[in-house]
């Protein structure tokens, strides 16, 4: 019989059950903005806004310094007395729009949803490694704001993002709102906006540039704002937003703004569409060419990529590339297919693609029926037209109008369809070594660390824990402080390493110690922990073989036992080769003789199942006595494999020495022809692994084997006549004399 | 140690203007907020006004508001305090005092000014 | 503006005695905002209390603040004869910021 080891689940090795505790901080209500500081002078500090308060934390997350940012019209509200004496608008919360750091200062900028939106800067003030705030100034100059003109108006209510460039001396502030019509009518904020910082820090600049809504689209066309960044010499806004000015409003798409950082000013303010989409490696009948598409941007992160992810999107390491969350839609529960997909966008080439539709729209010889677009925000026109216009004059340039590209830049899922049912809700990608890693939120209040690699089966887990009791979803902005990423989740704000909270979740030496090495794992004994887990018996440099099982798990006492060894960290090579003299096995006090791998036998194991095997022939010692013993596998002096090399013993009780005792045989006779199927009874017939009835010297073939009875089906007789009659275990005779004579037919 | 040391008070008359200087020593400058705290004779502490580490804020009382402007210079570790308009009850020792929201900790010795005719 | 009132306006004690020193606010103050400072005659002001309740660098341990919202208190244990002079509660929640009109402790 041809007994295998049964497959172990990858995910055996692993338990993501186990419990890490994380340094948190409770907000007292939920987190509606987060920022983090880190000084040159190694002061660090985070930033905390909830409703009509703003938290200043040290890096331990130990609250340093409360400000109240709310009720407006509560006299108690720090920052609108800032303003002066009110009354200033309206009463009411301030629920934090815009949390953002102005590096120039430094000084840390927030907008509220009360006071027309407007926002208050806050000098940051470094003691020791401790950071406070500067009293607040008001960022609004009542002369200078109408309701129809108000550049000191930042933040809507339906949302606001911002991101702050230095430009010479002055600050710009790269702000993009969500807009409905009662917002576009109360102190008219707009959609898209470049503005300045006055010196006095008395507000902003008049006469800054913007892109809105047309009025007669702001009904029924609203744009979210999901991400902004700056990289290089531009600025871009993440949105969510209808395919269409005219048709279906609920059919939305993902869109990338790109905005110049060097220039304050909206001329070259483009659009791209980002189409990420699932394509199974198997395509399902009735599944979309091309593969499910996602259009709804859920999170985003940019950042540079290490060497293994660079090489799969044929790009150099270190190259910035923007990573998208993406669902079906705004519930994001899909009919089939995952949850949430993960798509990579190199900034590279969404440059060059945007740059290409530039030159598309406005070299000659001109594109018959190529739209500007954009027209939520201008006048329809065709390209090379500016907005409006029927053609260009002399003294106006292509180039310097907002233009959509045409084409949009599809991307495929990195994940493959593995994050499943995962709903991911934040996002922040690192690179650590040479491995790029994305650190995900989810909407049940967990956080995913996973390896952001294209070519497996299977997610490459750094963590995957439970931030905390509650199971809210955790919030769309991370932070990064230092070798720590902040999430938020309901009122409290969690600190986790980059590195992974622990080790404590890999469950074998052998997964412990193939743990990137930026996790610092190291195996304690009997668990996978960080060298200040167990300083005494941690090490990095071996495992222990491990066995699971073994079969059979009876042999007999005189005769071989050709015993499989199931487990792992037996070979560390595929091949399973083993050089002489590294293997030990021994049965009670027998030894068991390894024997060369069947290369016919070798299969490929899939890297989501392992397991491996090792086979010895035991030949028990004269003094082995019969009863239960244990199965002991000693591995030393092994070449060191990648990770590490195996060193140790493991030892597996529940094999038994057991005696076969032949007691009857019957008929004891039957037709030279042979075909008689014989019936011999006894105790342990069922024993090792190999047994043979002989008749006369030749086999009788056996059809059934238990532990008190055999069946064979007789060989033909040479004559008639009585011959011998014999069974052997593991090739040794059991004890008896038996003889069956063959009759004529 | 950490040093404000006050000077620029003198005799001025009503109408007229002095600027007052706070050198600072001992301590990272550029980190703290600093204020400016006045006493007239025999009576309370009065707070004036009040600087962000990097000048990006400035607050002043009711009584002195558009007649009075602090300014720093970080590269100099100096605070100033223009004072215009001068009138007889902002007759007074005017202290510098260092930090905010830990409270002002650090105080100078204080330099007198006299407005009289 | 936020109004701080102090009382009494004038303490009489004995060395050895515990001085319990009061400041009002005319609105909520929230503590992180509420300081203590203790001036003696020809001398400049010396912080002994920020945050309503930390004592600063160098202060005496019978020093001692307390309170929330609109009263605090400052208390002084156990008087020691350098401990006779005028006392200012302060906030900088608010702009602009005030000072107490101060209690000044003097030796019975």
């Known amino acids: 019989e041809d007994w295998q080891c049964p497959r172990t689940p990858y995910a055996a090795s692993r338990d993501f059950d186990v419990k890490y505790v994380v340094p948190s901080f409770s907000a007292g209500g939920l987190v509606q903005a987060m920022v983090t500081y880190e000084g040159d002078r190694n002061e660090s500090a985070v930033f905390v806004a909830i409703r009509n308060r703003l938290h200043v934390l040290g890096p331990d997350l130990k609250s340093v310094q409360s400000l109240a940012t709310g009720p407006a019209g509560d006299p108690g509200c720090q920052t609108c007395a800032a303003c002066g004496p009110g009354p200033h608008g309206p009463p009411g919360d301030t629920d934090t729009k815009v949390l953002v750091l102005d590096p120039a200062l430094p000084a840390l900028v927030s907008c509220g949803s009360s006071l027309q939106g407007r926002c208050f800067l806050h000098d940051l003030e470094p003691q020791g490694t401790a950071v406070h705030l500067a009293a607040p100034a008001c960022l609004f100059s009542a002369h200078h704001n109408r309701p129809d003109d108000c550049p000191d108006c930042v933040a809507s209510p339906l949302g606001t993002r911002v991101t702050v460039v230095e430009q010479g001396q002055a600050s710009y502030f790269y702000v993009a709102s969500s807009l409905d019509a009662a917002v576009a009518a109360s102190f008219s904020p707009r959609s898209v906006s470049i503005r300045r910082l006055k010196a006095d820090a008395s507000g902003f600049a008049p006469g800054f540039v913007a892109l809105s809504v047309l009025p007669k689209h702001l009904v029924s066309y609203s744009i979210e704002y999901v991400h902004s960044f700056h990289t290089g010499a531009f600025v871009y806004f993440l949105t969510v937003q209808p395919a269409s000015v005219t048709d279906d409003p609920s059919a939305l798409h993902t869109r990338l703004a790109r905005l110049s950082a060097t220039e304050p000013e909206l001329g070259d303010y483009r659009e791209l569409v980002l189409d990420c989409r699932f394509a199974p490696k198997r395509r399902r009948r009735g599944a979309p060419e091309g593969g499910q598409p996602y259009p709804v941007l859920r999170v985003a992160h940019s950042a540079p990529v290490g060497a293994q992810l660079a090489t799969e999107l044929s790009i150099a390491e270190g190259q910035e590339v923007l990573f998208g969350v993406f669902v079906t839609g705004k519930d994001g529960g899909p009919g089939v297919g995952p949850n949430s997909v993960v798509c990579a966008f190199p900034i590279d080439l969404l440059d060059t693609l945007i740059d290409e539709g530039v030159e598309r729209c406005c070299e000659s010889p001109v594109h018959p029926g190529l739209r500007r677009g954009l027209d939520f925000f201008q006048s329809p026109s065709f390209c090379p037209n500016p907005p409006g216009l029927e053609a260009l004059s002399p003294n106006t340039s292509c180039r310097h109008f907002p233009l959509l590209v045409s084409s949009s830049f599809s991307r495929v899922d990195l994940f493959n369809g593995l994050l499943g049912p995962v709903q991911v809700t934040a996002l922040y990608v690192t690179r650590l070594d040479n491995v790029t890693v994305a650190h995900m939120g989810t909407m049940d209040g967990r956080i995913l660390q996973v390896e952001l690699v294209r070519s497996l089966n299977y997610l490459l887990y750094v963590s995957n824990f439970s931030l905390g009791d509650s199971g809210q979803p955790v919030q769309r902005d991370v932070s990064r402080l230092g070798d720590h990423l902040l999430f938020a989740s309901g009122d409290q704000v969690f600190q986790v390493p980059i590195q992974g909270p622990g080790c404590r979740h890999f469950l074998t030496c052998g997964r412990c110690l193939r743990a990137w090495h930026f996790m610092g794992c190291g195996w304690c004994g009997n668990m996978c922990g960080q060298q200040k887990e167990c300083p005494g018996s941690w090490q990095q440099d071996h495992c222990p073989p491990k066995l699971t099982e073994f079969h059979p798990h009876s042999g007999p006492l005189r005769g071989s036992t050709r015993l499989t060894l199931c487990g792992s960290n037996f070979y560390l090579h595929p091949s399973g080769l083993v050089p002489e003299g590294t293997h030990q096995v021994t049965v009670g006090q027998s030894p068991c003789r390894p024997l060369p791998k069947d290369s016919s036998k070798l299969r490929p194991v899939p890297r989501k199942d392992f397991v491996e095997e090792f086979e010895c022939e035991l030949e028990p010692l004269g003094t082995q006595a019969v009863g239960p013993t244990n199965v002991s596998l000693t591995v030393t002096n092994m070449p060191p494999g990648k990770h590490f090399r195996v060193d140790g013993t493991s030892v597996l009780r529940g094999f038994s020495f057991m005696e076969p005792v032949l007691i009857a045989v019957q008929p004891l006779f039957g037709p030279r022809a042979g075909g008689t199927c014989l019936t011999l009874e006894g105790q342990s017939l069922s024993v090792g692994t190999s047994r043979a009835v002989l008749v006369n010297g030749t086999e009788c073939l056996l059809a059934r084997v238990s532990e008190g009875q055999l069946l064979c089906a007789t060989p033909p007789g040479a004559t008639v006549a009585s011959v011998p009659l014999s069974l052997q275990v593991g090739g040794a005779q059991v004890p008896g004399s038996w003889t069956f004579q063959y009759r004529e037919d | 140690q950490v040093q404000l040391v006050e000077s620029g008070g003198g005799l001025v008359q009503p109408g007229g203007s002095l600027r007052l200087s706070c050198a600072a020593s001992?301590?990272?400058?550029?980190?703290?907020?600093m204020s400016w705290v006045r006493q007239a004779p025999g009576k309370g502490l009065e707070w004036v006004s009040y600087?962000?580490?990097?000048?990006?804020?400035?607050y002043y009382a009711d009584s002195v508001k558009g007649r009075f402007t602090i300014s720093r210079d970080n590269s100099k570790n100096t605070l100033y305090l223009q004072m215009n308009s001068l009138r007889a009850e902002d007759t007074a020792v005017y202290y510098c005092?260092?930090?905010?929201?830990?409270?002002?900790?650090?105080w100078g010795q204080g330099t007198l000014v006299t407005v009289s005719s | 503006d936020i109004v701080l009132t102090q009382s009494p306006a004038t303490l009489s004690l004995s060395p050895g005695e515990r001085a319990t020193l009061s400041c009002r606010a005319s609105?909520?103050?929230?503590?992180?905002?509420l300081g203590w400072y203790q001036q003696k005659p020809g001398q400049a002001p010396r912080l002994l209390i920020y945050?309503?309740?930390n004592r600063a660098t160098g202060v005496p341990a019978r020093f001692s603040g307390s309170g929330s919202g609109t009263d605090f208190t400052l208390t002084i244990s156990s008087l020691e004869p350098e401990d006779f002079a005028t006392y200012y509660c302060?906030?900088?929640?608010?702009?602009?910021?005030?000072f107490g009109q101060g209690t000044k402790v003097e030796i019975k």
């Open positions: 600087i962000s580490s990097r000048s990006s804020t400035t």
């Open positions: 001992g301590f990272t400058f550029n980190s703290y907020s």
């Open positions: 945050g309503a309740s």
């Open positions: 609105q909520s103050v929230s503590f992180d905002y």
């Open positions: 302060f906030q900088a929640l608010i702009m602009p910021f005030t």
């Open positions: 005092a260092r930090g905010y929201f830990h409270g002002m900790d650090y």
